[in-house]
Interface confidence: low
């Protein structure tokens, strides 16, 4: 979790002045309590926005908005803690608006932004915004909160920010899995525009559980610059048990701008119902090299039989 | 030249808390999942955590789970183990590690101490 | 959670010597590998990873092998700088579990 790095960030307008400093999460009417207190923030509302920094590298923002109540506690109203909790990581980020002078009621209700925090693809977060000074502790909550999940790397305004970009969101392997005699499997993909090594995993099911019954892993050389583009090719020797038809094949690159990271690209043959027919199914998922599967089996196989177009082994 | 610099270790009374922090220099840290290793005196290498480059992915040894919490700050090239209800067994040095593209862990900090002692 | 053993706990040998240390897996982990080389008061080093492919800087004399279930590290002449303790860890998925460790001396 971070701000956006550039331009000073503002929160004045018309009839306020106002600053924005940095919090540590916990404002010091916590610790000295006030008592009279504003009333909490109205219509909270979490955006999904786009903003470039001085480097002009695209990143999702969280776009925060929010009212005042009509009531005659913004005379008490000295500013608002903005708050925001990535949930899987229990990582937390405040800013404080401190409000240098006086709010008064005028003829249309304040309204107050805020677009610099910067988000993570495929991540939800908890924003919050305290009104301050926070209220005594057995006093009425003056603060709101909503839960914001953002796109992941498929959305396609997300496919061109940085982050996205930085893990491969660019690149199409454009997939295709063909069967061919003597159990055999062969995966095609696009190598992309950069000479990096890149990972097949075949995972196979049975098909009337969800039980994996085989595993293979293959590793292909990095491509020179003449082959950029090109189609590369893997056949996997299956395995000789006809139940274990339902293959599940990821690609992972391991691209300089993301290693570990890289968006993994996956198709999935369904076991043969009438012919070997079978149109692959595309999905894709967002993991780090470490945990090459999620929620299945570890591999049990590494068998080298058949070829592989660029075959390599790290 | 590629390094991880260990700070936060200390002596901690059982039930206490204590912050470790990892700052990374001479690659892109952003771009890399980092790791928490561990090693009681007189014993072996004991994973303790996981965090992927941009905190999307995060895992935990069973034996702090609950306890302690990963987080990394790319911007100032950190990395963060915030260890909470300290016992004994988690006295050790505390290692942060690199992990390879293909695997392993090619670079090491120098440890950090952690005393956990009433 | 797949455990990780490695034989034997402790060796001695001669400078000369070829050294062999295996680490077993309780489930097959491919080649998702990776042997360490610990000395006295150091940090850990990477010697070997994908089972078998020799990390940049380390001496030749040092080889990996297996896949599946099990692995076998190898000092074909042990030097008297290789008295250290040696690694297995397992990285396919989480928890990247370590091998207990073989301490390997100079008789």
């Known amino acids: 979790l971070r701000l956006l790095d550039h331009r000073a960030l503002v929160c004045s307008q018309p009839g306020l002045n106002c600053t924005v400093k940095n919090s540590t999460c916990l404002d010091d009417s916590w610790i000295h309590p006030r008592n009279l207190t504003p009333s909490s923030p109205k219509d909270l509302q979490i955006q999904l926005h786009f903003a470039h920094t001085q480097q002009g590298d695209l990143f999702p923002v969280a776009h925060i908005e929010w009212t005042l109540q009509t009531d005659a506690s913004i005379l008490y109203l000295e500013g608002a803690e903005l708050s925001v909790l990535q949930l899987n990581t229990n990582e937390r980020l405040c800013v404080r608006f401190e409000f240098l002078s006086k709010l008064r009621h005028h003829h249309r209700r304040w309204r107050f932004t805020f677009s610099h925090f910067v988000v993570d693809p495929d991540q939800e977060y908890e924003v919050t915004v305290h009104h301050l000074p926070k209220p005594i502790p057995d006093g009425d909550p003056n603060h709101q909160s909503k839960n914001f999940l953002v796109p992941d790397c498929e959305h396609a305004r997300m496919k061109v920010t940085t982050p996205c970009m930085s893990s491969g969101s660019l690149w199409d392997p454009n997939i295709t899995v063909e069967t061919l005699e003597a159990h055999q499997l062969r995966v095609s993909f696009t190598l992309w525009n950069e000479s990096t090594p890149y990972q097949v995993l075949l995972e196979s099911f049975s098909d009337s559980e969800n039980h994996s019954c085989f595993d293979v892993v293959k590793q292909i050389f990095a491509p020179r610059q003449e082959e950029f583009h090109q189609r590369a090719n893997v056949t996997f020797t299956l395995s000789k048990f006809h139940w274990c038809c339902h293959h599940h094949v990821q690609v992972q690159p391991f691209f300089s701008s993301c290693l570990n990271d890289c968006l993994r690209h996956a198709v999935t043959v369904p076991c043969p119902v009438i012919s070997n027919t079978t149109v692959p199914k595309p999905v894709a998922d967002y993991i780090p090299l470490w945990e090459p599967r999620s929620g299945s089996s570890d591999y049990k196989d590494d068998d080298d039989k058949g070829s592989s177009h660029h075959h390599h082994h790290h | 030249e590629v390094q991880l610099v260990e700070s936060g270790g200390g002596l901690v009374q059982p039930g206490g808390s204590l912050r470790l922090s990892c700052a990374a220099s001479?690659?892109?840290?952003?771009?890399?999942?980092m790791n928490w290793v561990r090693q009681a005196p007189g014993k072996g290498l004991e994973w303790v955590s996981f965090i992927s480059a941009r905190s999307s992915t995060i895992y935990y040894a069973d034996s702090v789970k609950g306890r302690f919490t990963i987080s990394r700050d790319n911007a100032k090239n950190s990395l963060y183990l915030q260890m909470n209800s300290l016992r004994d067994e988690d006295t050790a040095v505390y290692y942060c590690?690199?992990?390879?593209?293909?695997?392993?862990?090619?670079?090491w900090g120098q440890g950090t101490t952690v005393t956990v002692s009433s | 959670d797949i455990q990780m053993t490695q034989s034997p706990s402790s060796l001695s040998a001669s400078v000369g010597d070829r050294v062999t240390i295996t680490c077993r897996a309780s489930?097959?982990?491919?080649?998702?590998l990776a042997w360490y080389q610990q000395k006295p008061g150091k940090f850990p080093e990477l010697l070997i990873y994908?089972?078998?492919t020799l990390q940049s800087g380390v001496p030749s004399r040092f080889s990996g092998s297996g896949s599946g279930t099990d692995f076998t590290l190898t000092i074909s002449s042990l030097q008297p700088e290789d008295v250290a303790t040696y690694y297995c860890?397992?990285?396919?998925?989480?928890?990247?579990?370590f091998g207990p460790g073989t301490k390997v001396d100079i008789k």
């Open positions: 590690a690199r992990p390879k593209v293909g695997g392993g862990m090619d670079v």
């Open positions: 001479g690659f892109t840290f952003s771009s890399y999942s």
């Open positions: 860890q397992k990285y396919n998925r989480a928890p990247f579990t």
């Open positions: 994908a089972a078998s």
């Open positions: 489930q097959g982990i491919s080649n998702y």
